[in-house]
């Protein structure tokens, strides 16, 4: 902490400007009014302060707002956000998507830090649910964001937000997460026609039950093997050879290359050899 010392004559800051970069830490502490800093936070980012100087500015804001910064200050924190701890951020009440975007921009290109995770958590909890605009914003900055949420957290995602999800956003989701997301996607895309529906729902099919896969097999969807490999084992096992053949269409030949891998291996093992032979792929149950 910086010791309390009187501001030297003529050094009292009247505005936040570049002259302050020449101030020593104790001078910043003594000569910069916290209220002035709060009202001119937008200028801080344009000034090349050292990390040590930023520590002093943060300290001044902490003294002015011991219960947490107001959103008018938070929105203009810029690089000072990197100095915040998760404990600091837990005191904030961030409601504006613009504020969230401004702070995520500061951390852009880096992995999600504990500070960012706390900020997002505060924001989403404040909104009560992950609406489409928020999800759009978060997945734009962090494509893996959706899959970092627990199944419980994902349950607060409204079906309307699913439209914002891109296939790559689901790359790291595990089966339990897809179990939660699939019914929402099914609801979101229910009014689309067959081929368009399949294009949209495909990324979510890792959460689909057997009856939905049976229904898809009647629609000439030609599911690729990569999607088939991500299906739930319990959903695949009850499918007949005929149903899998219809589901995969021309891709059925790909089963041979995956015959030693789950869930294909588990499915093959539970089929009658006579039925497998109808595929002409040499699969052994």
């Amino acid at each position: 902490e910086v010791e309390k010392t009187a501001c030297p004559s003529g050094k009292k800051a009247r505005e936040i400007d570049e002259s302050l970069i020449f101030y020593k830490k104790w001078e910043l502490e003594a000569c910069v009014d916290a209220a002035l800093l709060a009202t001119q936070m937008d200028r801080v980012n344009a000034i090349p302060f050292t990390y040590e100087q930023l520590d002093v500015l943060k300290h001044k804001l902490d003294e002015l707002y011991p219960q947490g910064y107001p959103e008018s200050v938070i929105q203009h924190l810029g690089y000072l956000f990197l100095k915040m701890s998760p404990e600091d951020i837990r005191k904030w009440n961030v409601t504006s998507l613009e504020t969230l975007k401004a702070l995520l921009e500061v951390n852009k290109g880096h992995e999600m830090s504990p500070q960012v995770a706390t900020l997002i958590d505060r924001f989403v909890k404040g909104r009560g649910q992950l609406d489409k605009d928020t999800l759009d914003t978060l997945t734009a900055f962090y494509p893996g964001y959706l899959c970092s949420l627990s199944p419980e957290e994902l349950s607060s995602v409204p079906p309307s937000s699913i439209w914002a999800v891109r296939p790559q956003d689901l790359d790291t989701c595990d089966p339990r997460q897809l179990d939660v997301l699939y019914p929402k996607a099914r609801l979101a895309f229910q009014n689309m026609n067959g081929s368009e529906y399949f294009v949209k729902i495909q990324s979510f099919l890792g959460g689909a039950p057997t009856e939905d896969l049976k229904a898809l097999s009647q629609q000439n969807v030609s599911m690729d093997l990569a999607t088939f490999m991500k299906l739930r084992t319990d959903a695949v096992l009850p499918l007949t050879v005929a149903e899998v053949q219809k589901l995969l269409g021309p891709h059925v030949e790909g089963l041979k290359a995956e015959e030693r891998h789950r869930p294909v291996r588990d499915w093959i093992l539970r089929q009658r050899q006579d039925d497998l032979d109808t595929l002409g792929l040499g699969l052994q149950g």
């Epitope: 339990r176 084992t233 030693r260 891998h261 789950r262 093992l269 539970r270 149950g285």
Partner: antibody
């Protein structure tokens, strides 16, 4: 609840065939969801999967042991068995039988039986 | 065959510590990864299946994460009964390989 019990000789001579049986109680070896595996663990070493069998008789073996392993199932006795031919001292291990549930993993194990290969 | 590499091979920790064990597959195995605990003279016990699902009856201090090639087993607060050897295993490929094991010892 399902329990597994291994049985068989504890001492086998080199070049002979090791034979073990696993008896399933409290459940059926003809379960749709389960395969039945043999796994071994040499003294002070890690686990090595030997192979599995499904009640239909379909088998799958560890490639490194495939030429010497035979696993069979007897649904009427609710048992499955392991035969490992041409044994050497390197086959000395604790041999476990285990249930492999398709949705979970090796969720039920026998207590293990020590088999020593020595003349 | 898919190779499974566990690290560390052994570690010393105290009761109450947070312990993390990692397992790496030589190729992608999706979420098909199981974790087992084995105590001396006993058969292994299934802790986690499908990378992150807790087996029935296993304390919630155990958790698993990961997908693809990199996986983690975490014990949030080590208890006296947790000192044991832990193995990862992949059921994705028909070779069913185990990791080499991680022995968790008392510091």
């Amino acid at each position: 609840q399902v329990q597994l019990q291994e049985s068989g000789p504890g001492l086998v001579k080199p070049s002979e065939t090791l034979s073990l049986t696993c008896t399933v109680s409290g459940g059926s070896v003809s379960s749709f969801t389960d395969t039945w595996s043999w796994i071994r663990q040499p003294p002070g070493k890690g686990l090595e999967w030997i192979g599995y069998i499904y009640y239909s008789g379909s088998t799958n073996y560890n490639p490194s042991l495939k030429s010497r392993v035979t696993i069979s199932v007897d649904t009427s006795k609710n048992q499955f068995s392991l035969k490992l031919s041409s044994v050497t001292a390197a086959d000395t291990a604790v041999y476990y039988c285990a249930r492999d549930n398709v949705f979970t993993g090796f969720d039920i194990w026998g207590q293990g039986t020590m088999v020593t290969v020595s003349s | 065959d898919i190779q499974m590499t566990q690290s560390p091979s052994s570690l010393s920790a105290s009761v109450g510590d947070r312990v993390t064990i990692t397992c790496r597959a030589s190729q992608s195995i999706s979420s098909y990864l199981n974790w087992y605990q084995q105590k001396p003279g006993k058969a292994p016990k299934l802790l986690i299946y499908a990378a992150s699902s807790l087996q029935s009856g296993v304390p919630s201090r155990f958790s698993g994460s990961g997908s693809g090639t990199d996986f983690t087993l975490t014990i949030s607060s080590l208890q006296p009964e947790d000192f044991a050897t832990y193995y990862c295993q992949q059921p994705y490929d028909a070779s069913y390989t185990f990791g080499g094991g991680t022995k968790v010892e008392i510091k």
